[in-house]
Interface confidence: low
């Protein structure tokens, strides 16, 4: 599933090339392994901002598909509880390009540990 | 055709650079507040073709207390479990796209 998440992220990267979305999004660029689920949830939440601001149906659907895939993968790991992690709103806001790059990195972290 | 002043959003301000049709502007959360993750600060001046009246789209923005400031008070650590993230329900006919 995480591999499919990466391919959806690549699709989103391609789709937004032609759009002017100047949003800045909460981005965890240095994910601590003990906070990776919390960080992933922030990425998934902020991905919805891209969906909202793009106004493009294909982006809406790719985002929704990605969220379903990621949730399935997270739940298959069982209920992991993480404490003392940063809330999304405490993270630094970065542009969409940097956000998506960091998103790919955290997904790769999940791939490497699954 | 131009848009009227945009609606107010709690704990946020907006400085409109242009009221022209298709202008895109952003609200900014007030000091001590942060944009809630997953919400958008964007508003766009669009035309309702049925009435020929321009209006600003409704932003999904929610401004919440800055957790960094809240955490300055003693509080239990935040805990997260792997319950799913649900996509925000999207209107089937968004008000901003008439």
């Amino acid at each position: 599933n995480w591999v499919n998440v990466i391919s959806d992220l690549k699709k989103i990267e391609d789709l937004i090339q032609s759009m002017h979305i100047d949003a800045t999004l909460y981005t965890e660029s240095d994910v601590h392994p003990s906070c990776k689920v919390t960080a992933m949830k922030c990425f998934l939440l902020e991905l919805q901002v891209i969906s909202l601001e793009s106004g493009d149906a294909s982006i809406h659907d790719t985002v929704e598909n990605l969220i379903i895939l990621a949730n399935n993968s997270l739940s298959s790991n069982g209920n992991v509880t993480e404490s003392g992690c940063k809330e999304c709103e405490e993270l630094e806001e970065k542009n969409i390009k940097e956000f998506l790059q960091s998103f790919v990195h955290i997904v790769q972290m999940f791939i490497n540990t699954s | 055709i131009t848009c009227p002043p945009p609606m107010s959003v709690e704990h946020a301000d907006i400085w409109v650079k242009s009221y022209s049709l298709y202008s895109r502007e952003r609200y900014i959360c007030n000091s001590g507040f942060k944009r809630k993750a997953g919400t958008s600060s964007l508003t766009e001046c669009v035309l309702n073709k049925a009435t020929n009246v321009a209006h600003w789209t409704t932003p999904s923005l929610k401004c919440i207390r800055d957790p960094a400031l809240v955490h300055q008070r003693p509080a239990p650590p935040s805990t997260v479990t792997t319950a799913g993230v649900t996509p925000q329900p999207e209107s089937l006919s968004p008000s901003g796209k008439e």
Partner: antibody, heavy 117, light 106 residues
Framework: EVKLKESGPSLVQPSQSLSITCTVS????????VHWVRQSPGKGLEWLGV???????DYNAAFMSRLSITKDNSKSQVFFKMNSLQADDTAIYFC???????????WGQGTSVTVSS | EIVLTQSPAIMSASPGEKVTITCSAS?????MHWFQQRPGTSPKLWIY???NLASGVPARFSGSGSGTSYSLTISRMEAEDAATYYC?????????FGAGTKLEIK
């Protein structure tokens, strides 16, 4: 108010092509995708394809070799072309607006097409 | 492709009766949409993403389900509910529809 209206021939000769235009109002084709669906007594509702806001298309594999969907955003028109029609292509052809999540939230009235010599 | 099987194909219900229409998918899908169609008209979106009522749909309608099993329920049948109902999956291409359930009023 969102509206879609299909226009095209009601009768097509076997082996000929079918061209239908879907004219829309109340929304922008640069933002919203448009699906094509047909309905016949024998096969029920069949999804044929979709053209996205950005211009890319997805087709039902069963029709891909003979189907083309294009559009003119400035004229608010979507063009459907299917080649090599046979009698079993006789159906009502609909265009439908795509909301989020592949929701066909508004449909045209449909145009009835008979394939016969 | 994902095949959607609706049951029953035809049914009739008395006013006030509870009605349930089911849609079974040949493989698991994320969500199901439902359309209502009356004779001579185009399909109308009725329920989207499994359980959300489209604009103007009476609250006596509800949708539920997951995986391969979905259903549309009318808590109390009314004459205006007589129509054909179709399910549609949006999880994989090609998008597919069920063959329909024709609901008649007794």
């Amino acid at each position: 108010e969102v509206k879609l209206k299909e226009s095209g021939p009601s009768l097509v000769q076997p082996s000929q092509s079918l061209s239908i235009t879907c004219t829309v109002s109340g929304f922008s084709l640069t933002t919203y995708a448009v699906h094509w669906v047909r309905q016949s007594p024998g096969k029920g509702l069949e999804w044929l394809g979709v053209i996205w806001g950005a211009g890319s298309t997805d087709y039902n594999a069963a029709f891909m070799s003979r189907l083309s969907i294009t559009k003119d955003n400035s004229k608010s028109q979507v063009f459907f072309k299917m080649n090599s029609l046979q009698a079993d292509d006789t159906a009502i052809y609909f265009c439908a607006k795509n909301g989020a999540y592949y929701v066909m939230d508004y449909w045209g009235q449909g145009t009835s097409v008979t394939v016969s010599s | 492709e994902i095949v959607l099987t609706q049951s029953p194909a035809i049914m009739s219900a008395s006013p006030g009766e509870k009605v349930t229409i089911t849609c079974s998918a040949s493989s698991s899908v994320s969500y199901m949409h439902w359309f209502q169609q009356r004779p001579g008209t185009s399909p109308k979106l009725w329920i989207y993403s499994t359980s959300n009522l489209a604009s103007g749909v009476p609250a006596r309608f509800s949708g539920s389900g997951s995986g391969t099993s979905y259903s549309l329920t009318i808590s109390r049948m009314e004459a205006e509910d007589a129509a054909t109902y179709y399910c549609q999956q949006r999880s994989s291409y090609p998008l597919t529809f069920g063959a329909g359930t024709k609901l008649e009023i007794k």
